[in-house]
């Protein structure tokens, strides 16, 4: 079927394939530190490395970039690891009004895949 | 807010920037001629080109991304080119009885988005 | 480890005000916010108010509004909550409670609280 | 502002029960719920936040689960040092609630 399974293990070495990272970041370097109030700090899971092929794949459009990478790989990137998932994340901010807490939904990712 | 406006206009010049480019692929490319028996040829929609600061953000996520990837380039990856949606297709393959029609939600690219 | 301490026990007539203090050790004081949490005798927990220790903003209750003030000494990491115009009904025991550093909206620890009287 | 309804108000059980405490809140708040426990004369101490996720020292016989407006507390084997009163509290939105809390007492 178009739906060739995934690969799941990294081809290229312990922590070199599209997985989820943590990243520090402080509200100053998000450029919010003027209206979000707190978290100060905010632990960001990022989806980070390398693509090889068929790794993870989203879909069965991923698995057809892959190939085509293979064979035009000036013409068709390789697939990139992008979230999957994302968990959700409460922030307290300023508003007009006051101040208030507000959930955003796509901030932190829960999950990465090969799109 | 958090949502600050993605730009639309790409600062790399024309075709530099994510955007959706058609690719011909034959049933050969991509390994199906085996249980595809229609179409031969594939116009396959995909997302392609680059994702400066800001451009076509998917989310929040891929907005704060864009901006760690400007404090910590070998950390934190840039944003990339994928699709924000698919145009179904339908396929004619083999199947053990015969032959059928079966509908693809999630082969060629519709939208892209920096994400 | 991370410990609120407050003020002792208060007994205040109708009408006077009531300034409870909330020193913050074992942590950044001014990196995590402050809540106020009130229990009358043999009640629920009612929430107060909130500050930002880092900015000083303030979110209250609307039904104390106009009657209480949270203030910080980020020298001393100190949260202070006054209520002025005290009634009979505010007699309760009065807790800081920090945000979790987990969940701004939850709250961990809490301070061993104050117990306020209002009698005339 | 978000009510939370907490039920039982009370609970008789036994060491080694298992006891469920439910919170239901007035319009969604996502998983933005917190459990506390409190012992008569102490502050309230909290075991759970963001629905589910255990605070750290907390034992594990502990579960929370839930989203949206129905959440649920687990204790999976009731322990004496466990009967205390709990409460639920809404973190989606200003102000703060607290449900009416549940007293677990011995059978």
């Known amino acids: 079927s178009a739906h060739a399974h995934p690969r799941d293990s990294c081809p290229l070495g312990p922590g070199r394939c599209c997985h989820l990272e943590t990243v520090q970041a402080t509200l100053e370097d998000l450029g919010w530190s003027d209206w979000v109030l707190s978290p100060r700090q905010l632990q960001l899971s990022m989806c980070v490395g390398e693509c090889p092929h068929l790794y993870r794949s989203a879909n069965t459009h991923a698995q057809i970039k892959a190939r085509l990478h293979g064979l035009q790989p000036d013409k068709v990137p390789a697939p990139c690891c992008v979230p999957s998932s994302y968990t959700p994340v409460v922030l307290m901010h300023r508003t007009d009004s006051g101040v208030s807490l507000q959930t955003y939904d796509d901030l932190v990712a829960r999950g990465c895949h090969c799109a | 807010s958090a949502h600050a406006h993605p730009r639309d206009s790409c600062p790399l010049g024309p075709g530099r920037c994510c955007h959706l480019e058609t690719v011909q692929a034959t049933l050969e490319d991509l390994g199906w001629s085996d249980w595809v028996l229609s179409p031969r040829q594939l116009q396959l929609s995909m997302c392609v080109g680059e994702c400066p600061h800001l451009y076509r953000s998917a989310n929040t996520h891929a907005q704060i991304k864009a901006r760690l990837h400007g404090l910590q380039p070998d950390k934190v990856p840039a944003p990339c080119c994928v699709p924000s949606s698919y145009t179904p297709v339908v396929l004619m393959h083999r199947t053990d009885s015969g032959v059928s029609l079966q509908t693809y939600d999630d082969l060629v690219a519709r939208g892209c988005h920096c994400a | 480890q991370v410990q609120l301490v407050q003020s002792g026990a208060e007994v205040k007539k109708p009408g006077a005000t009531v300034k409870v203090s909330c020193k913050a050790s074992g942590y950044t004081f001014d990196s995590l916010g402050m809540s106020w949490v009130r229990q009358a005798p043999g009640q629920g927990l009612e929430w107060m108010g909130y500050?930002?220790?880092?900015?000083?903003?303030?979110v209250y209750a609307q039904k104390l509004q106009g009657r209480v003030t949270m203030t910080t000494d980020t020298s001393t990491s100190t949260a202070y909550m006054e209520l002025r115009s005290l009634r009979s009904d505010d007699t309760a025991v009065y807790y800081c409670?920090?945000?979790?550093?987990?969940?701004?909206?939850?709250?961990?620890?809490w301070g061993q609280g104050t117990l306020v009287t209002v009698s005339s | 502002d978000i009510q939370m309804t907490q039920s039982p108000s009370s609970v008789s059980a036994s060491v080694g029960d298992r006891v469920t405490i439910t919170c239901r809140a007035s319009?969604?708040?996502?998983?933005?719920l917190a459990w506390y426990q409190q012992k008569p004369g102490k502050a309230p101490k909290l075991l759970i936040y963001a629905a589910s996720s255990l605070q750290s020292g907390v034992p594990s016989r502990f579960s929370g689960s839930g989203s949206g407006t129905d959440f649920t507390l687990t204790i999976s084997s009731l322990q004496p040092e466990d009967f205390a009163t709990y409460y639920c509290?809404?973190?989606?939105?200003?102000?703060?609630?607290f449900g009416g809390g549940t007293k677990v007492e011995i059978k």
């Open positions: 319009q969604g708040i996502s998983r933005w």
């Open positions: 409670a920090r945000e979790s550093g987990q969940q701004v909206s939850a709250l961990d620890p």
């Open positions: 509290q809404q973190g989606a939105s200003f102000p703060l609630t």
């Open positions: 500050i930002s220790t880092y900015s000083g903003d303030t």
